[in-house]
Each structure stands twice: as C-alpha cells, then as structure tokens.
C-alpha cells in the first residue's frame, strides 16, 4: 500500500499479480513528486494497492473504471 509523506502518498513497490477486477471500486494516480509513477487501486474493503501503470492489466482496469 502507498506510503504517505506530508500527505502525498507514494509507492515504492508494485503488486505483480492482477487484482480481481470485481474487488476494485476506484483508483488514483500518485503525485508527480513521487519517485515512482504509480496507480493506486482502492478495493471494496478500502485497502489501497500500488500498481505499475505500464502493466497491461493495470491499463485495462483503468479503462474499464473510466467507462463505468
């Protein structure tokens, strides 16, 4: 999950495996101030999971979340 520094969440590692799409309710991008670009998925249990925006499954999930 993202690490908060001065209220700016940043990610230092990414989840490798795809999360179940049905478990994800929203997402956000971390700040450009962070050293690693990341997408943070928020699960239906309100857990935050860092993901690599370059991964295919991450892009696919973002697209589907944008459409829903």
């Amino acid at each position: 999950s993202p690490y908060s520094s001065d209220t700016t969440p940043c990610c230092f590692a990414y989840i490798a495996r795809p999360l179940p799409r049905a478990h994800i309710k929203e997402y956000f991008y971390t700040s450009g101030k962070c050293s690693n670009p990341a997408v943070v998925f928020v699960t239906r249990k309100n857990r935050q999971v860092c993901a690599n925006p370059e991964k295919k499954w991450v892009r696919e999930y973002i697209n589907s979340l944008e459409m829903s």
Epitope: Y14, A16, P18, P20, R21, K55, W57, E60
Partner: antibody, heavy 119, light 108 residues
Framework: QVQLVQSGAEVKKPGASVKVSCKVS????????MHWVRQAPGKGLEWMGG????????IYAQKFQGRVTMTEDTSTDTAYMELSSLRSEDTAVYYC????????????WGQGTTVTVSS | SYVLTQPPSVSVAPGQTARITCGGN??????VHWYQQKPGQAPVLVVY???DRPSGIPERFSGSNSGNTATLTISRVEAGDEADYYC???????????FGGGTKVTVL
C-alpha cells in the same frame, strides 16, 4: 528456498469430501497468493481458485463455486483446499501454486496430490 | 469466458526451433505466461508477462505476443525440452486464471 509440500494421495467414494493441505516454507504464507490448480488424467491444467492477500478474500472458479473451500492457517503456514460432493470426474492431481516477489504468475508449485474418486 | 487455443502437438528435430502458439481474442492486450510440464511432474514457469524469463530458465526460451496470437519459441531444441506446454492469462471479465489446452512438444 521456497518450497510447497502437499499431503499424500487420497481415495474417496462419490459424494464424500477431500481436504488437501499445502505446507509452505521459505516465506510467510499470508504475503503471497496461494492458488489451486487441478489436472485430470491425460488432460490439461484447470484453475480452481485462490487467495487474494491484498483484500483478504478468496476467489473461486465458477465451475467449483459452492463445492470448494480454500483456507489458510497462517500459524502453521499451511493452505488447505476442500472439495465436497465428489464425483468420478474429480479424479485428478491437485496442485497448490503461488506467485512470489515480482513475478505475476504461478512461480512455485507443490508436488501434487492425487485424488481418486471411485465406488 | 476467455478461451485460449493451442495446437495439440508440435514436433521438432534436435537443434531446430520449436514455436508453440496460443490464440485468443485480442490476446496482445493481455499478459501471457507459459509453463512447461514434464510427465509426472508439476508445471514450471518458463516465461511470464509475454517475454520475461524467471531466473534459471535458459535464454533458449523466449516469448512474444501480437494481435490474436502469443508464441513461445524454443531455440536449439534439446531432448530435455520434450514436455507439455501451457499458456495462461488473467481474464478480468470473470476474475479467473485461464489456461490453454496444452501443446505436447516431441523432439524427434
């Protein structure tokens, strides 16, 4: 060294249940996703379901929904797969498998447990 | 649900190149993983994320993914490469891992 060691072969009668265990060593069970895959004699691999540690949930393949239960005992680093209402078509080798570190697929596998369903 | 189609068998002479295909609708939009399974043994991951190799897997194993077909290529085939090979993807529509039917590689 990551290792997954499964319980021994089982012979069951139709209608019975079977519970297969998978003991992990070399890492902590709740850090990674444990999945179960089966292979009927002479057939291909079939995913049954798995644990999602990030959300504390287990997901099951639709085909097995309601008939399979996957659990984990983190105190002993052992995962379990229980399949109920067994039929002859459930005769197969059952594998536990897990991802590990930065690899998004099933990097480590148990040796397999043969389950035979016969009257 | 998502369907992966593999040829049942591929034959190749030692030292030659084996190509194993895995077909699926717009499969290039998915990450494909490949497993090798020898008789009586558990599967072994040989390629993940289309073309990456886990440590310990020889460079002779490589993968590609374009259009509706992903391919596992085994260069300079050896007798020890004789096995069944399975492709796998994550289907986000069903939240299921999906395997192809498998391809038996025979080294002549």
């Amino acid at each position: 060294q990551v290792q997954l060691v499964q319980s021994g072969a089982e012979v069951k009668k139709p209608g019975a249940s079977v519970k297969v265990s998978c003991k992990v060593s070399g890492y902590t069970l709740n850090d990674f996703a444990m999945h179960w895959v089966r292979q009927a004699p002479g057939k291909g691999l079939e995913w049954m379901g798995g644990y999602v540690p990030e959300d504390g949930d287990t997901i099951y393949a639709q085909k097995f929904q309601g008939r399979v239960t996957m659990t984990e005992d983190t105190s002993t680093d052992t995962a379990y797969m229980e399949l109920s209402s067994l039929r002859s078509e459930d005769t197969a080798v059952y594998y536990c498998a897990t991802d590990y570190l930065y690899i998004p697929s099933l990097s480590y596998w148990g040796q397999g447990t043969t389950v035979t369903v016969s009257s | 649900s998502y369907v992966l189609t593999q040829p049942p068998s591929v034959s190749v002479a030692p030292g030659q190149t084996a190509r194993i295909t895995c077909g699926g609708n717009n499969i290039e939009s998915k990450s494909v993983h490949w497993y090798q399974q020898k008789p009586g043994q558990a599967p072994v991951l040989v390629v993940y994320d289309d073309s990456d190799r886990p440590s310990g897997i020889p460079e002779r194993f490589s993968g590609s993914n374009s259009g509706n077909t992903a391919t596992l290529t085994i260069s300079r085939v050896e007798a020890g490469d004789e096995a069944d090979y399975y492709c796998q993807v994550w289907d986000s529509n069903t939240d299921h891992w999906v395997f192809g039917g498998g391809t038996k590689v025979t080294v002549l």
